[in-house]
């Protein structure tokens, strides 16, 4: 899915009004420094498109965020502010019925979820350049 | 077996209202994230609200303001009550059941925004 046209002030306003909580939330007891970003992403486009990587493919050690709250509204605000973005999306849901894991807290989904904080502030900062 | 079935769709006079409903079994209700999509003539489907089990909520741009989503985790009933309507609401509405590996739908209803 090509991001270019998604409405980015209302993600953004979405992720700063919820999905940031819920990162927040899923990370407690998790300190900040624990965990090295190695993921980024150069403007906003490639963020949401790195964003959506890492939220609902499953990965080894890390089989699936996509039961977790921010997944779900992340799987919602794009939905809603992606034109054509759903339509996507109900053929990949139904692919992923065949690899669905129990929903179990990992050292590596904390990662990974530290990379998507990562990846959403700089989704949050478009015009800072790339360090 | 999941079913969602709506109700509550009808011909209404713009700025009149209306409210759907979203009546759905075989699935603990709570657990998922709750949608109405809807779908003009000719145009794509499009998710106009979203609520979640935590309580908040999501609206496309188009009816912020005039929509309102809520749930009724006891009677596993979702709704949307519509306000305002215009002409461009016209289109049949769609209730989702969305989890991580499939979307479920209803079967639609129809919304007609008419003189």
């Known amino acids: 899915y090509d991001f270019t046209n998604c409405d980015f002030e209302k993600i953004k306003a979405a992720y700063l009004s919820t999905i940031s909580k819920d990162l927040i939330t899923y990370m407690s007891g998790t300190k900040s420094t624990e965990f090295n970003n190695t993921v980024s992403c150069s403007n906003r486009p490639h963020c949401l498109t790195e964003i959506q990587s890492l939220t609902f493919n499953p990965t080894a050690g890390c089989a699936s965020l996509a039961k977790e709250m921010f997944a779900m509204k992340t799987k919602a605000a794009l939905a809603i502010w992606c034109p054509g973005y759903s339509e996507t999306q109900i053929n990949a849901t139904q692919a992923m019925k065949k690899r669905r894991k129990r929903k179990v807290t990992t050292n590596k989904c904390l990662e990974q979820v530290s990379q998507l904080q990562g990846l959403w502030r700089r989704f949050n900062r478009p015009l800072l350049k790339q360090q | 077996e999941v079913q969602l079935v709506e109700s509550g769709g009808g011909l209404v006079q713009p700025g009149g209202s209306l409210r759907l409903s979203c009546a759905a079994s075989g699935f603990t209700f709570s657990s998922y994230w709750m949608g109405w999509f809807r779908q003009a003539p000719g145009k794509e489907r499009e998710l106009v609200s979203a609520?979640?089990?935590?309580?908040?909520?999501m609206y496309a741009d188009s009816v912020k303001g005039r929509f309102t989503i809520s749930a009724d985790n006891s009677k596993n009933t979702a709704y949307l009550q519509m306000n305002s309507l215009k002409p461009e609401d016209t289109a049949v509405y769609y209730c989702?059941?969305?989890?991580?590996?499939?979307?479920?739908w209803g079967q639609g209803t129809l919304v007609t925004v008419s003189s």
């Open positions: 609520i979640f089990s935590d309580g908040s909520t």
């Open positions: 989702t059941r969305d989890s991580t590996d499939t979307r479920y």
